[in-house]
Amino acid sequence: QLLEPCGYIYPEFPVVQRGSNFTAICVLKEACLQHYYVNASYIVWKTNHAAVPREQVTVINRTTSSVTFTDVVLPSVQLTCNILSFGQIEQNVYGVTMLSGFPPDKPTNLTCIVNEGKNMLCQWDPGRETYLETNYTLKSEWATEKFPDCQSKHGTSCMVSYMPTYYVNIEVWVEAENALGKVSSESINFDPVDKVKPT
């Protein structure tokens, strides 16, 4: 039998920009209040199993408590909402992982080379470390035709799956996206024949 949690933390998947402030709330279910004879003032917040100081906690109403963190710098924190019930027995209500990092920088210095008769490799500078899962996508178009996207495995280069056509200009750019933002590099326009790597 699956046991329903006693309440929830919102947001459920918190991602915070490093150095900024962050507030989470824990909402207890009515049934939980009655079963354990508690209200939100009984909530104990913990980060990585250590109790959060009381001055960071606010009881909003009988079911809801909030916690505020200033200048978040740790890359990953386990945040839990717990209740003290029946003579100080601590009961876990809900837990989330709070991640912190940066939105992606605009990729710069985009360059491409063509391996004749094979494929095209493009490389770029992703900028500063984001400390978050960040997806880099190489995008390309010719006139009004969109080519397949190239998903980068390493975040600094991508080998396109198509063989570019010579003697027509294509446009190539890089998109970077994580939980904190989405950006695009400026595009470069070139005829692939001009980027052929001498064998």
Epitope: E141, T144, K146, W173, E175, V183, S184
Partner: nanobody
Framework: QVQLQESGGGLVQPGGSLRLSCAAS?????TYWIYWVRQAPGKGPEW???????????YYADSVNGRFTISRDNAKNTVYLQMNNLKPEDAAVYYC?????????????????TGQGTQVTVSS
């Protein structure tokens, strides 16, 4: 004469919708990235959205993401900005701009609206 003409603005209540159009005359719109920019009274211009030449790539300002949708019909030489769930802070003159390539998103350079634009008013 080569020009872009914006239309479709008007007065709408908060929560309402409008569809703006950007039509090209004198040149083929399909060879350009199109950017929507807005400028509220007493404020600087703000990038709103862009669409690539094929229409396959779109970008939005955080303030409009999820509410606005940019699209293009290259056969009609027109780009559209569908604006839903409008808010009072969306009120501005909206302009479209053309660029031969992707300026990056969000663009670093300051937009310089040149056309007449179309006025969007959001008020109850």
């Amino acid at each position: 004469q080569v020009q872009l003409q914006e239309s479709g603005g008007g007065l709408v209540q908060p929560g309402g919708s409008l569809r703006l159009s950007c039509a090209a005359s004198g040149f083929t719109l399909s060879t350009y990235w199109i950017y929507w920019v807005r400028q509220a009274p007493g404020k600087g211009p703000e990038w709103v959205s862009t669409v690539s030449r094929s229409g396959g790539t779109t970008y939005y300002a955080d303030s409009v993401n999820g509410r606005f949708t940019i699209s293009r019909d290259n056969a009609k030489n027109t780009v559209y900005l569908q604006m839903n769930n409008l808010k009072p802070e969306d009120a501005a003159v909206y302009y479209c701009l053309a660029s031969v390539s992707n300026l990056g998103w969000p663009p670093v350079r300051a937009p310089s609206p040149t056309g007449q634009g179309t006025q969007v008013t959001v008020s109850s």
